[in-house]
């Protein structure tokens, strides 16, 4: 009896998570990504805000920029020039969209210990970066690109046609930022800084989304964003390259678009420099199942860029769209013409291929019923990549090294056995020539970041182990988590179940399904998190489940492309199927089942509630899409085609939430949206609400004034408090 008595007394000193813990970020973790500046040196901002240079080989470190200097301009970020002479300091950060922001920039001269005076940068700047060699500066101000040969020099203006909401140079417009590039920039230096490539986006003909921003003034402001919804006019993109050594000599030269792409609407998808005089561009047809990779060379005689047809590589999908979420980008080898790239193999799994001349003759480097996720680095003798191969858990990420210098190439898992229980989901960051690398483990245990030797893989030191977090969690009753799979009709449904600390299989628990379910997403991942659903399990005794159904990623094309051209069908079916299986497990109170989701998850949760199954008592949709006609062209058409009669209009029409208004009658529905959502427009929820009112269906709603898709700041606290009350009421849990 003694051991169990001791155990009980220990349990009594432990407490459940509170909502306050979650909202205060009490149990958040830290990661450590070195800011590499050479093969063996990196910069890091210390706890007291000094910028410190660490030398791995000497074990020494020294401060190159003091917190006093940082504070003098209220700097929140910095960037060292590659020649190590200057640092830009970034302040007055002002967020725009997901990645974009404007800021004020100051240049500090390290050799002289003072700020560069004269020819100061204008403000606010939309994007600024150093050349990869030396200390040239490229920046975007008021949608135009400028170049400085040295920080103190006067700027050279490269473009002149930039205009707010019309012409964007060197930065993406809204849709390219969010759905194609996933960056705040659209300019790329060549490896030695000789050339600068940039995109020009012409949004002149794009319809504008307009919404009110209420602010504090007597009259609200109207925010106008050129935003192409499905089927609308898209931005017109052009790529230019300028010689930065003699920028005025011939000026920007346009890079030609492959003929097979230019014949109809198209997108530019990415640019990769190979050498200073060779560049690789990727293009995509508007119907996103054909991608063309084009390798272009500089013609010294004409001062132009030549993209021969023989250097065009076509990637086409016959079962879905091209690529995963995005078309993958190439990683070039040292010969500067062959490259490594991830795309679907003949069995429909995304794997690394080596392309030397044609895609048809590609050599497959990895294979199996799993997927290669990311190529981190290719050196003379090694290729480092991540995959979910290990032990056949799709929600894990391990780092592998393939020796490409030897034949046959040998493969080694670098991370699989390092901290096997604690660490099953890794990413990595490599120094020059992969001399050293940092591993960042995200869980399932407490995250840890470590430094390793690139040749031996030996761990050199722990960079961040989250000791404070570990100590803080010692007296917390965390929920139990398990990742398992259901086999249903030849479909594997992986799920994560979060169980109350004293879970007892013989008892009945309320169930909350948390869903995202968007194409090429993955919710069931072996990562650490102490969040709202952890609290619901720990304190409120709920079981929470996340299920990856059809349309989700990293388990092969059959699952991924199952949703092609019919969003809103199988994702919902698979959540429902999983719920039925969970009920069969015997510990779920089938009268107390709820579902909730955000964004795409709000769409799926709404459709699940309106499925007429009677399974769900209540549910929440936060910032849901309600009709694919309301969402961005680039994203929507990738999966749905066009909303035209001769394409897929019918499914656009019958996959709306509004069409199911009648079915909400028998559920409790909470609809939530920010009025300043630039991404999933408030229009989506306004239309749901209108349809429910017209159908005389009662529902609950909450709007967040002037909040975007993230519902950040004080809205977050209000949101989670509100949703907690709603769920507790639904599940008859006392407050």
């Amino acid at each position: 009896l003694r051991p169990s008595r001791v155990h009980n007394s220990e349990e009594n000193t432990m407490r459940a998570l509170t909502l306050k813990d979650i909202l205060n970020g009490t149990f958040s973790y830290k990661t450590f990504f070195p800011n590499w500046i050479s093969g063996q040196e990196y910069l890091h901002q210390s706890a007291d805000n000094n910028i410190v240079l660490y030398n791995i080989e000497t074990g020494q470190s020294y401060t190159i920029l003091s917190n006093r200097t940082m504070k003098s301009v209220n700097a929140s970020n910095y960037g060292l020039s590659p020649d190590r002479q200057f640092v830009y300091l970034e302040s007055d950060y002002s967020k725009l969209w997901r990645y974009s922001y404007t800021a004020t920039y100051y240049i500090y001269d390290l050799s002289n210990g003072e700020f560069v005076r004269g020819n100061e940068l204008p403000r606010p700047i939309q994007y600024l970066c150093w050349s990869p060699v030396g200390s040239k500066l490229a920046y975007v101000y008021q949608n135009n690109i400028y170049l400085k040969q040295r920080p103190g020099d006067p700027p050279f203006q490269i473009t002149f046609n930039g205009r707010e909401n019309k012409i964007f140079n060197g930065i993406p417009d809204w849709v390219y930022e969010e759905e194609m590039l996933a960056t705040k920039y659209a300019l790329w230096w060549s490896p030695n800084g000789k050339f600068l490539a940039y995109a020009e986006f012409n949004d002149t003909d794009i319809p504008v989304i307009a919404y009110s921003y209420y602010g504090d003034e007597q009259y609200p402001r109207t925010i106008n964003i050129p935003y192409p919804k499905a089927g609308a006019k898209n931005p017109v993109v052009r790529i230019f390259i300028i010689d930065t050594t003699y920028p005025a000599y011939v000026g920007p030269q346009e890079v030609p678009v492959p003929a097979m792409i230019a014949s109809s609407d198209y997108y530019f998808s990415w640019l990769t420099w190979v050498t200073d005089e060779r560049v690789c561009l990727q293009w995509l047809k508007r119907v996103q199942n054909v991608s063309v990779l084009s390798i272009c060379d500089f013609r010294e005689d004409w001062q132009t860029w030549d993209c021969p047809k023989t250097q065009e590589h076509i990637e086409e999908s016959r079962t879905g769209w091209a690529g995963g979420f995005f078309v993958s980008t190439p990683v070039f080898s040292y010969d500067a013409i062959s490259y490594y790239k991830i795309f679907s193999d003949k069995d429909g799994y995304k794997h690394i291929h080596y392309i030397k001349d044609t895609v048809e003759n590609a050599i497959q480097i990895t294979s199996g019923k799993w997927e290669a996720i990311n190529i981190f680095r290719v050196t003379q003798d090694s290729l480092f990549y991540s995959s979910n191969e290990f032990e056949e858990y799709p929600g894990r990420r391990n780092i592998y090294r393939i020796s490409i210098g030897s034949y046959p190439p040998s493969k080694k898992c670098v991370t699989c056995h390092l901290r096997k229980e604690r660490c099953q989901y890794y990413t990595a960051s490599f120094s020059d020539y992969a001399k050293y690398y940092a591993l960042v483990c995200y869980g399932p245990g407490i995250p840890i970041s470590t430094l390793h030797d690139g040749r031996t893989d030996q761990e050199i030191k722990i960079l961040e182990e989250n000791k404070e977090l570990e100590n803080a969690l010692k007296n917390i009753q965390l929920p139990k988590e398990e990742i398992k799979k259901l086999e249903v009709d030849e479909i594997t449904l992986w799920y994560k179940m979060i169980l109350p600390p004293q879970f007892d299989r013989s008892k009945k628990y309320p169930l909350l399904i948390q869903v995202y379910g968007g194409p090429c997403s993955q919710s069931v991942r072996s990562v650490f998190a102490v969040n709202w659903i952890s609290y619901l399990a720990s304190k409120e005794g709920m079981v929470i489940a996340l299920v990856d159904g059809r349309g989700t990623a990293f388990q092969g094309d059959k699952l991924l492309y199952a949703v092609y051209r019919k969003l809103g069908v199988y994702e919902v079916e698979d959540q429902i199927t999983a719920v039925r299986k969970f009920i069969e497990m015997g510990f779920i109170d089938e009268k107390r089942i709820a579902i909730w989701g955000w964004s795409y998850g709000g769409y799926v949760s709404s459709l699940a509630l309106a499925s007429g199954t009677g399974l769900f008592k209540c549910g929440i949709a936060v910032a849901p899409v309600s009709s694919w006609e309301y969402y961005a062209s680039v994203y929507t058409e990738r999966f749905m085609g066009l909303p035209t009669k001769d394409d897929n209009l019918e499914h656009y029409k019958n996959s709306t939430v509004m069409a199911r208004a009648e079915y909400f009658r028998n559920v409790d529905y909470l609809l939530i949206h920010g009025t300043a959502d630039d991404n999933v427009h408030f229009q989506n929820s306004a239309q749901i609400a209108k349809a429910l009112v017209n159908a005389q269906v009662d529902f609950q709603a909450m709007w967040y004034s002037d909040q975007n898709h993230g519902l950040s700041g004080l809205s977050t606290n209000h949101l989670y408090t509100h949703m907690t009350h709603f769920l507790k009421q639904c599940f008859s849990l006392s407050d």
């Epitope: 063996q40 080989e57 000497t58 060292l80 190590r84 001399k435």
Partner: nanobody, 117 residues
């Protein structure tokens, strides 16, 4: 106290050559990136060459192809071989960590290089 001792400067005709040396105390030299800097009268100090511990080098365009930085790890010394010198190369030349360390009175006396036309 860390010591950096530059030497090898002098007066030279345009087109001529000089080889500068910088002896550093071990604690600072071993494994660290080092640089040669110069300061002409009335101008800011600027980098002319940098070398990492593994021998990777950097030169600004103004000296590329004319100057060569090297290091002898056994002797804790870095060198700057300067060829095809021009009058505009006239300056006091210093060695230091690359980038320099703050709050560290590391700039030595330097060595004067004068290129006459």
């Amino acid at each position: 106290q860390v010591q950096l001792q530059e030497s090898g400067g002098g007066l030279v005709q345009a087109g001529g050559s000089l080889r500068l040396s910088c002896a550093a105390s071990g604690s600072i030299f071993v494994g660290n990136a080092m640089g040669w800097y110069r300061q002409a009268l009335g101008n800011q100090r600027e980098l002319v060459a940098g070398i990492t511990s593994d021998g990777t080098t950097y030169y600004p365009d103004s000296v590329k192809g004319r100057f060569t930085i090297s290091r002898d790890n056994d002797k804790n010394t870095i060198y700057l071989q300067m060829n095809s010198l021009k009058p505009e190369d006239t300056a006091v030349y210093y060695c230091n960590l690359w980038p320099p360390r703050i709050g560290f009175a590391s700039w030595g006396q330097g060595t004067q290089v004068t290129v006459s036309s």
